[in-house]
Amino acid sequence: RCRAGTQPLDSYKPGVDCAPCPPGHFSPGDNQACKPWTNCTLAGKHTLQPASNSSDAICEDRDPPATQPQETQGPPARPITVQPTEAWPRTSQGPSTRPVEVPGGRA
């Protein structure tokens, strides 16, 4: 099976050849096609956890409930100035973050 950060090149023989996700995409593995990262900033939310080649970003509301302590808010939104992600026209162009080199190959 294709591991995290990679996707099958051939849907008929999943796990035989696995290529890394393209930039800005992620795959949790298990032969899943790469999907675009969510852009928390453009969804009007904080980025609680940045996306990686193997997982999507985790977002949280900018204004947590009044009862929630201030220090539990997420970090400031990252300075991204792009629009929200949309479905990929290719069946699966997929991701990787800047410091990460995505291994290809099989799990």
Epitope: L9, D17, A19, G24, W37, V82, P84, Q93, P103, G105
Partner: antibody, heavy 121, light 107 residues
Framework: QVQLVQSGAEVKKPGSSVKVSCKAS????????MHWVRQAPGQGLEWIGG????????TYNQNFKDRATLTVDKSTSTAYMELSSLRSEDTAVYYC??????????????WGQGTTVTVSS | DIQMTQSPSSLSASVGDRVTITCKAS??????VAWYQQKPGKAPKLLIY???TRHTGVPDRFSGGGSGTDFTLTISSLQPEDFATYYC?????????FGGGTKVEIK
Amino acid sequence: QVQLVQSGAEVKKPGSSVKVSCKASGYTFKDYTMHWVRQAPGQGLEWIGGIYPNNGGSTYNQNFKDRATLTVDKSTSTAYMELSSLRSEDTAVYYCARMGYHGPHLDFDVWGQGTTVTVSS
Amino acid sequence: DIQMTQSPSSLSASVGDRVTITCKASQDVGAAVAWYQQKPGKAPKLLIYWASTRHTGVPDRFSGGGSGTDFTLTISSLQPEDFATYYCQQYINYPLTFGGGTKVEIK
């Protein structure tokens, strides 16, 4: 038709930076990953990295990770590649190249015309 | 990094000849190989992806083959416009890497 038009030739001093642009037309810019590849004189092709305009996510060749910065301006359908701390061995033709439209294959189906960067003191 | 070694580095041939270029990967890359043609002073052009699939508009005299570590690009009947340099590229793993090129010259 689908086209990538790059900025003109540059002559730079060692230690300086260069920023090359690549303006896309004929397709939906944000939906295709844009990559950068360079070719030193008389040499082969070397992949620098790529960026997905829709969310700004980028992937770099580790050989360039600390010196190359890829950005996009979606309002003008333009991709940029900035290379810092230039040295003579960075003298090359720099190409932008769009990733193709056939499934998850990481190949390049449309290329810019190339930008010659000369690093010389 | 995966090394892609092409051979020969150059060859001389005549119009009408059958020409075969080989590319050897330093490790198994499945079928994740593309081939490009480049003419002097011009950008490369995609010919083949997925080892053997011709890109749109590429003449059927160009064919690709192989899997694993050994790949070939064959031009069944060389035409005047085919004199150029040819490169293979692997995309099973980052960084994406290219072969050193094979220059096809007129005999």
